[in-house]
Amino acid sequence: AGVFELQIHSFGPGPGPGAPRSPCSARLPCRLFFRVCLKPGLSEEAAESPCALGAALSARGPVYTEQPGAPAPDLPLPDGLLQVPFRDAWPGTFSFIIETWREELGDQIGGPAWSLLARVAGRRRLAAGGPWARDIQRAGAWELRFSYRARCEPPAVGTACTRLCRPRSAPSRCGPGLRPCAPLEDECEAPLVCRAGCSPEHGFCEQPGECRCLEGWTGPLCTVPVSTSSCLSPRGPSSATTGCLVPGPGPCDGNPCANGGSCSETPRSFECTCPRGFYGLRCEVSGVTCADGPCFNGGLCVGGADPDSAYICHCPPGFQGSNCEKRVDRCSLQPCRNGGLCLDLGHALRCRCRAGFAGPRCEHDLDDCAGRACANGGTCVEGGGAHRCSCALGFGGRDCRERADPCAARPCAHGGRCYAHFSGLVCACAPGYMGARCEFPVHPDGASALPAAPPGLRPGDPQRYL
């Protein structure tokens, strides 16, 4: 067992003339994701044939919006590796298909639209446990740069992940007949793994995956005792001293092939011929199709109509994830402008706007002063979504309709008395103070601290504030 790992380095325009147009636009921002499909061997297989070694989808990449007039750059990529686990031996030679998909994030009905941007394919030889292999593939005007490797999952090692290693039981050496595990010299090669189900009491193996029977036992897993009585219809010669094989279960008895697979005996075991859409030793594995209901929360399943093609979920507004399983907190993007309150209603987004603003996203600033008059010579001032009147002297209130009391704010300092006057207010200052608001003390020698009193006015006379 092990994992095939694919690292996408870049996806963008290839060299040469005819650079492709950016797949995203300011009107339709988009993001990329990738799908990899692996098949064993080097045969030229149709793109639709099953991904018998496995398949994987990447996460979605960052949202990208084209800069008008700029050439298509390398597009932002999803984080992380694409990992395809394999259960059995790594075949050493394999075919791959890597698809680049575009998810458009416009306001279209039914959620994001998906389209295949590029597909590259190839056949390679690769030993498990080796270094990353780098590759460049072109599809039309696009270029994809990537690296890949196959690595074994412990305890498997070797170029096909078939040898098993275990930590040493003794510090100095491995057990009888077992060698140290290169490159893990502190571990030992484990005993061979026989065919799954091979009887530990009555079977043994000299090659991985085989099951050879001790004397007196037979069957593909060495679980059938050899009869010592005579028999009429032997399956084959007996290795017992007397008697023959009981016509016990053959490898296809009870049909080990699942999901309608048909079984045929082979010299060593059995082989399943699987119906379309199923694969694996016993036809126990199947592709996932739209019939599996893989899209949640009302997501629309597209593709994957036949068992060998991948499905894709088109998510309704408010949901995301490869299976529409994640709810999007659309208000976290703060779509409501000018302090509007965001409400996610599930089927739609609503903005409750502050006074003076309107529009689906509160983007329109209403003309606060339109049709509003300020009385008594006041002027209207817009601001903050509400109109305000700047009133002429002597008037106040929202619309400047109220006559102002200029003395209400106690403007005269140091105990000065305030008198309302047609043109404002007058302060009668207490002895020792002068100025329009009685703010300046009079010095004992008769000279005032700045400013000087106007001619004709003595300190202590009422000072009219104009």
């Epitope: 398949a55 686990p85 126990e284 996932v288 949640f296």
Partner: nanobody, 117 residues
């Protein structure tokens, strides 16, 4: 490889209840979907209900309000509580598991549910 073991099928009267269980073992990757499909004699296999490991669910229209799917991620198990059973619910019920990372699925052997008086 993933192995699926179903239990809980049997004979029940119309209007009765039954709970199916399915336990998955093997390489059950973290992000996956478990659920139930059924196949009545002479008909295609159809989705009954399924559940993403994140909690989202799907139900066939014919079972909405009567059947409830639930799962225990720690035990890699899925359950189908079937109430108000009808004769047309009679079928072999198959457990289904598939991983999200690699679009690869496995089926259980099936358990027979018979609704009859």
């Amino acid at each position: 490889e993933v192995q699926l073991v179903e239990s809980g099928g049997g004979l029940v009267q119309p209007g009765g209840s039954l709970t199916l269980s399915c336990a998955a073992s093997g390489s059950t990757f973290t992000s996956n979907v478990m659920g139930w499909h059924r196949q009545a004699p002479g008909k295609q296999r159809e989705l009954v209900a399924n559940m993403h490991s994140g909690g989202s669910t799907n139900y066939a229209d014919s079972v909405k309000g009567r059947f409830t799917i639930s799962r225990d991620n720690a035990k890699n198990s899925v359950y189908l509580q079937m109430n108000s059973l009808r004769a047309e619910d009679t079928a072999v019920y198959y457990c289904r598991w598939y991983g999200i990372q690699r679009a690869e699925g496995y089926w259980g052997q099936g358990t027979l549910v018979t609704v009859s008086s």
